[in-house]
């Protein structure tokens, strides 16, 4: 048994680091393999992570931990039962993919502006809650074409754009993902998607 | 209420062995990292060695590395310090002290918050 | 290894008047921010070690609020707002970041 990729990791930069790996050949990779994890800290202990399967030979991890800071570094140890497969370390502040965004809301009722707002996916203690900028994407469902992003490079988890920008009369659909620039991190997934009508009063047009 | 109770001190010759107790109770004793630190006549506080709950992770003092041995017994709730190749300047009164919470993948530190009465150790001919 | 430096060694205080105990690192205890990894620890005479602060400016449990905590890095003090008699003793500050933890040299709490 041999690992064909080496694990890699991304932090949410809260509590759950994921890593992935592939083997050289199918796995049962809860039954087969432990990936344990260790902060390099004073007195602190191994912690294991029973892996899932990730299509035929890969495997995912997702490792618990109670908080990150940029400082915290992690020795990690892939097994298969006595054998020691992979050894190599881990630095959460240096591979950030952020928690995607919630609650993403359509507000259509603020005269002919759109409203769209999200929930940032962090609390506020956390160093990325004032460090997030966003990537709004609307597209209509019924024109490939039609697709558009809008970057959101102001703190406010919200963007207003007019009505008429888009057309009326036919539906639309949003989602919204984020990034840190601090971190230098890769973009979150995309938020689920929502959907509603755009229909606006044409300007009243004099002959 | 939380408490630790040292035992083992004594007067033993140079080169001699002793071997230290402090049991532990009020606490969940495994989730605990254990120190000992010690504290010769007249002089300051020195530190000696550090086990992590588990036992799975171990430091000492420069000056006691090879000769002493820190261990634990979580079944029965305490702490062990086996001093081996005893000599004069390890005399001294020797406490355990309850470290930081060790099981959470961050360990969880609020100061050698518990300290055991000491015990005297001797090291004389 | 990480060298703790205190002073004053001897401190005379009037009952009632403020005191001040300065400690010195030789590295940075600051781990993350508001976490530094030192400790405050009085050792009255004839009796074991107790804790008054820790992570720099934590009061540790059932500590009076006379006593207090502060600095960041290099630089800690502990405070006393008003000496009582019962504070004297030996005051000792010690780091936790690595291995080995080490204290200072204790300070001298006396009461004039």
């Known amino acids: 048994m041999k690992v064909l990729q080496e694990p890699t990791c991304v932090s949410d930069y809260m509590s759950i680091s994921t890593c992935e790996w592939k083997m050289n050949g199918p796995t049962n990779c809860s039954t087969e393999l432990r990936l344990l994890y260790q902060l390099v800290f004073l007195l602190s202990e191994a912690h294991t992570c029973i892996p899932e399967n990730n299509g035929g030979a890969g495997c995912v991890c997702h490792l618990l931990m109670d908080d990150v800071v940029s400082a915290d570094n992690y020795t990690l140890d892939l097994w298969a039962g006595q054998q020691l497969l992979w050894k190599g370390s881990f630095k959460p502040s240096e591979h950030v993919k952020p928690r995607a965004p919630g609650n993403l809301t359509v507000h259509t009722n603020v005269s002919d502006t759109l409203l769209l707002t999200w929930s940032n996916p962090y609390p506020p203690d956390n160093y990325l809650y004032n460090h997030l900028t966003y990537a709004v994407n609307i597209w209509s469902e019924n024109d490939p074409a039609d697709f558009r992003i809008y970057n959101v490079t102001y703190l406010e988890p919200s963007l207003r754009i007019a009505a008429s920008t888009l057309k009326s009369g036919i539906s639309y659909r949003a989602r919204v993902r984020a990034w840190a620039q601090c971190y230098n991190t890769t973009w979150s997934e995309w938020s689920p998607s929502t959907k509603w009508h755009n229909s606006y009063r044409e300007p009243f047009e004099q002959h | 209420e939380v408490q630790l109770v040292e035992s083992g001190g004594g007067l033993e010759q140079p080169g001699g062995s002793l071997r230290l107790s402090c049991a532990g109770s009020?606490?969940?004793?495994?989730?605990?990292?254990m120190t000992w630190v010690r504290q010769a006549p007249g002089k300051g506080l020195e530190w000696v060695s550090s086990?992590?709950?588990?036992?799975?992770?171990?430091y000492y003092a420069d000056s006691v590395k090879g000769r002493f041995t820190i261990s634990r017994d979580n079944s029965k709730n305490t702490l062990y310090l086996q001093m081996n190749s005893l000599r004069a300047e390890d005399t001294a009164v020797y406490y355990c002290?309850?470290?930081?919470?060790?099981?959470?993948?961050?360990?969880?530190?609020?100061?050698?918050?518990?300290w055991g009465q000491g015990t005297t150790v001797t090291v004389s001919s | 290894d990480i060298v703790m430096t205190q002073s004053p060694l001897s401190l005379p205080v009037t009952p009632g008047e403020p005191a001040s105990i300065s400690c010195r690192s030789s590295?940075?205890?600051?781990?993350?921010?508001?976490?530094?990894?030192v400790d405050w620890y009085l050792q009255k005479s004839g009796q074991s070690p107790q804790l008054l602060i820790y992570e720099g400016n934590k009061r540790a449990s059932g500590v009076p609020d006379r006593f207090s905590g502060s600095g960041s890095g290099t630089d800690f003090t502990l405070k006393i707002s008003r000496v009582e008699a019962e504070d004297v003793g030996f005051y000792y500050c010690?780091?936790?970041?690595?291995?080995?933890?080490?204290f200072g040299q204790g300070t001298k709490l006396e009461i004039k």
């Open positions: 009020g606490f969940t004793f495994r989730d605990f990292a």
């Open positions: 002290a309850k470290d930081r919470l060790s099981v959470t993948v961050r360990p969880r530190y609020y100061g050698l918050d518990v």
């Open positions: 086990i992590s709950g588990s036992g799975g992770n171990i």
């Open positions: 010690m780091q936790s970041l690595t291995s080995p933890y080490t």
């Open positions: 590295q940075s205890l600051l781990y993350s921010i508001g976490k530094n990894y």
